[in-house]
């Protein structure tokens, strides 16, 4: 028996369902009574789901997994993982045994989009050219860790005096806070871009500082 999985990682958004595809080629006359199917975590061999003795043995992994029972006899051994969590990320091995056996691993990459950044300024009044100001760009509930870029109004990257911190919450999602310290010119626009490297999703925020009231 030869087991086939997708070579590319499966990307799944947090709280959505994901399908880890796995297939094998049944011989003529194959019956489910002959099938021994195991899904397990590659790195620990922890059992996730199994099908033996002609029966779906069910989920051994937080009761969020399911097979496609009607498709098994055709060689579809794919696994459905419901309500994906950050902690589900990793490699899953599909092991099929009939007369002989084979296995293959598929990677699950979990992702969550970052929120539109909010911008704050300190100090936020009585600003004069030459003042040192701190601009904070905050974006929330994303995964995996973000890449943060700052630019001025002309699109020139600002790399000095930038401090970025990323903190995971209890669900494993990251809140990003990036701080830019800059000396004010006569006026100027400062943009922050928060990029999710897996989703290739960019979230933009900007603040324009003039002699007049601030605009965000």
């Amino acid at each position: 028996v030869e087991v086939q999985v997708s070579e590319d990682p499966v990307v799944a958004l947090v709280d959505t369902d994901a399908t880890l595809r796995c297939s094998f080629s049944p011989e003529p006359g194959f019956s489910l009574a002959q099938l021994n199917l195991i899904w397990q975590l590659t790195d620990t061999k922890q059992l996730v789901h199994s099908f033996t003795e002609g029966r779906d043995q069910g989920s051994a992994y937080s009761n969020r997994t399911a097979l496609f029972p009607d498709l098994l006899v055709q060689g579809n051994a794919s696994l459905r993982l419901q309500r994906v969590r950050v902690t589900d990320e990793g490699s899953y091995t599909c092991f099929v045994s009939i007369q002989d056996f084979d296995s293959a691993a598929v990677s699950l990459q979990v992702a969550a989009p970052y929120s539109k950044p909010s911008m704050t300024l300190e100090p936020n009044k009585d600003l004069r050219p030459g003042n040192m100001v701190t601009i904070t760009c905050s974006s929330y509930q994303g995964y995996p860790e973000a890449e943060v870029f700052w630019k001025d109004g002309q699109g020139v990257p600002l790399t000095g005096n930038v401090t970025t911190s990323q903190m995971a919450n209890e669900r494993g999602l990251f809140d990003v806070h990036s701080v830019l310290r800059v000396v004010l010119g006569a006026n100027g626009t400062y943009s922050c871009l928060v990029r999710n490297p897996v989703l290739q999703q960019d979230a933009h925020g900007s603040v324009t500082i003039t002699g007049q009231p601030l605009t965000f």
């Epitope: 021994n36 195991i38 397990q40 790195d43 620990t44 061999k45 922890q46 059992l47 199994s50 033996t52 003795e53 043995q57 051994a60 091995t93 092991f95 045994s97 007369q99 002989d100 056996f101 084979d102 296995s103």
Partner: antibody, heavy 118, light 109 residues
Framework: EVQLLESGGGLVQPGGSLRLSCAAS????????MSWVRQAPGKGLEWVSG????????YYADSVKGRFTISRDNSKNTLYLQMNSLRAEDTAVYYC???????????WGQGTTVTVSS | QSVLTQPPSASGTPGQRVTISCSGS????????VNWYQQLPGTAPKLLIS??QRPSGVPDRFSGSKSGTSASLAITGLQSEDEADYYC???????????FGGGTKLTVL
């Protein structure tokens, strides 16, 4: 040729320590889980410990938990078993074995003898 | 007390067929590969059969089968050099441990 070669066995007093090594050759060591299995004189085979290919996951038999530590150095193609607080009942031939993706210990070393006695 | 149960001994005459049984549970043999090892006196164990698959170099006189939570090893055309200890083994995903049978000493009469 696929080969596993154990070393480090010997005579040690109860409460003492010993470190076993298993040198692997002829295959991509870093791609395989590995195990230690022992056999007391005149007795059957007893699994001792296992470790994942990267070393991130380790498992132990209840009889050695907290006393033995399995580790590996993939750059040196070597598996280790650090044995502390040794007891007379740890006296055995210790084998290292390759543990493949199909849950088969398919290649075994020739074994190294550990004797715990005062 | 071993997790997998094997008869302690078996015997046969040259040319005969002998079988050795191994009984386990759903968390080991029931869904995991069952392996059979031959250990000749004074040597390391050697893989003989996995489920019903023979590694290259193992004579086709040796065969394995598995049904439910039990497995068996059959040896046909018994030869004097088959006299050895035979062990079944499987990964147990409830115990997170390899489990072995107590071993069966095969005597060729």
């Amino acid at each position: 040729e696929v080969q596993l070669l154990e070393s480090g066995g010997g005579l040690v007093q109860p409460g003492g320590s010993l470190r076993l090594s298993c040198a692997a050759s002829g295959f991509t060591f870093s791609s395989y889980w590995m195990s230690w299995v022992r056999q007391a004189p005149g007795k059957g085979l007893e699994w001792v410990s296992g470790i994942s290919s990267s070393g991130s996951a380790t498992y132990y038999a209840d009889s050695v938990k907290g006393r033995f530590t399995i580790s590996r150095d993939n750059s040196k193609n070597t598996l280790y078993l650090q044995m502390n607080s040794l007891r007379a009942e740890d006296t055995a031939v210790y084998y290292c074995a390759r543990w493949n993706d199909y849950d088969i210990m398919d290649v075994w070393g020739q074994g190294t003898t550990v004797t715990v006695s005062s | 007390q071993s997790v997998l149960t094997q008869p302690p001994s078996a015997s046969g005459t040259p040319g005969q067929r002998v079988t050795i049984s191994c009984s386990g549970s759903s968390s080991n043999i029931g869904r995991r590969t069952v392996n059979w090892y031959q250990q000749l006196p004074g040597t390391a164990p050697k893989l003989l059969i996995s489920n019903s698959q023979r590694p290259s170099g193992v004579p086709d006189r040796f065969s394995g089968s598995k049904s439910g939570t039990s497995a068996s090893l059959a040896i046909t055309g018994l030869q004097s050099e088959d006299e050895a200890d035979y062990y079944c083994a499987s990964w147990d995903d409830s115990l997170n441990a390899w489990v072995f049978g107590g071993g069966t000493k095969l005597t060729v009469l």
